[in-house]
């Protein structure tokens, strides 16, 4: 008789999850010389230990502490790029501007990017059928708690001028319920962070509105100002040109507004 299994509303663990995490870890340590000595099996064991045999709606930040310790990494604190709802462009940017880092450019962010995982209470099995959905099932699920934990730590580490890339095509350019809005904004340290600079990325080619005047951006400015951090905002009217100018800043067309 097949054992009854909890059916969750979200997709199950990404197939070949253990192999994927291990392979990503090895690849990351090969690309980043400062991580060359890292034992990826230990990293995977700590990752696994955070959610295996635990109820997938009862995961805590504490469960991830062994992994956080092993994943400790020094990123230049004044070169941090946060993003909300515009991951691809943020990653394209840091691939060109190699001295800037998104969370997914760190080991832990790189390991988990675009993956789903969960286990089952009291069994060592990984659940490949379904995992809890943040809205429909529970917020304290393995994936959500992981991103909340690493995002908080990433924001806490930031200093000087912190940049955030926001999607100007969305109805809420700044969304209080996003990871950026609910976690990162509130964990920037005013004693270390001088300014949060928002880059609002325009979607339409003919869109010349000043999206820095958007009510949600004003809301972000208000939250940030109340935390004694300065706020500035820039419109990026042409994201394609923006990336091109990051690649080739000497290009004559890059002096005009982008």
């Amino acid at each position: 008789v097949p054992r009854w299994r909890q059916q969750w509303s979200g997709p199950g663990t990404t197939k070949r999850f253990p192999e994927t995490v291990l392979a990503r870890c090895v690849k990351y340590t090969e690309i980043h010389p400062e991580m060359r000595h890292v034992d990826c099996q230990s990293v995977w064991d700590a990752f696994k230990g955070a959610f295996i045999s635990k109820h997938p709606c009862n995961i805590t930040e504490e469960d991830y502490q062994p992994l956080m310790k092993l994943g400790t990494q020094t990123v230049p604190c004044n070169k941090i790029l946060l993003w909300s709802r515009i991951k691809d462009l943020a990653h394209q940017f840091t691939q060109v501007q190699r001295d800037m880092f998104t969370l997914e450019d760190t080991l832990l962010g790189y390991l988990a990017d675009d993956l789903t995982w969960c286990g089952e209470f009291n069994t060592s099995k990984i659940n490949y059928q379904s995992c809890p959905d943040w809205r429909k099932d529970c917020s304290n699920n393995p994936v959500s708690v992981f991103w909340k934990t690493v995002s908080r730590r990433f924001a806490e580490a930031a200093c000087d001028v912190v940049h955030v890339m926001l999607n100007g095509s969305r109805s809420k350019i700044f969304d209080k319920n996003s990871t950026f809005g609910s976690v990162e904004v509130h964990n920037l340290q005013p004693e270390k962070v001088q300014t949060l600079e928002a880059w609002v990325i325009h979607g339409g080619r003919e869109d010349s509105r000043d999206l820095c005047q958007d009510p949600t951006i004003k809301e972000l400015e208000s939250i940030i100002s109340k935390r004694n951090i300065q706020f500035s905002c820039k419109n990026i009217y042409r994201p394609d040109k923006f990336l091109q100018c990051v690649k080739n800043p000497e290009d004559s067309s890059c002096t005009s507004e982008i």
């Epitope: 010389p33 060359r36 000595h37 890292v38 034992d39 099996q41 230990s42 990293v43 310790k69 092993l70 400790t72």
Partner: antibody
Framework: EVQLLESGGGLVPPGGSLRLSCAAS????????MSWVRQAPGKGLEWVST??????????YSADSVKGRFTISRDDSKNTLYLQMNSLRAEDTAVYYC??????????WGQGTTVTVSS | QSVLTQPPSASGTPGQRVTISCSGT????????VHWYQQFPGTAPKLLIY???QRPSGVPDRFSGSKSGTSASLAISGLQSEDEADYYC???????????FGGGTKLTVL
Amino acid sequence: EVQLLESGGGLVPPGGSLRLSCAASGFTFTNAWMSWVRQAPGKGLEWVSTIRSKTDGGTPYSADSVKGRFTISRDDSKNTLYLQMNSLRAEDTAVYYCAKYDYNYMDVWGQGTTVTVSS
Amino acid sequence: QSVLTQPPSASGTPGQRVTISCSGTTSNIGRNYVHWYQQFPGTAPKLLIYRNSQRPSGVPDRFSGSKSGTSASLAISGLQSEDEADYYCAAWDDSLNGWLFGGGTKLTVL
């Protein structure tokens, strides 16, 4: 065959200087991270310095006990690793080994050169 | 300079199995690979085990390494008189940005 040959050791008074060399052969020196490790008489191994390959930034690392006094460097055109030792102290007396990395561990060691700091 | 913790001595009779432990912290053994070196008097250290449990070619399979959490161990089975030597564990330490060695274990074959 991979070979590492240290030279430059000797007797030096406290406060003096020495430059150790390590001539490498049998592998692509340019790509290798390299280290110096020492062993005081009758004692255990103690890491001194490591230098990355130029392609990995050429970054040097040194133990706190030698920081500001010892400098690791490399000359890829000569396949040679160096350790410039200044302000030498009695506690720096040791056999100094040079070692090559195989990605993330030290796999081959030289035979060592003896440094004695004494007046 | 802090070191990884090893017992100063170990002993066994020929044919026996002996184990040498090496303990550290999260910033060295916990996070990074452990390697083992064998050293005979008056000679340079020789790589015995790398990346926790891998044996370089030429090292007999009587030697094995393992790691769990912040500790590692070297096991020698079927002990032979020629195994009498000093054994050192080593791991990179991310806090120090450098290598840490164990204090060394002198193995005596009785």
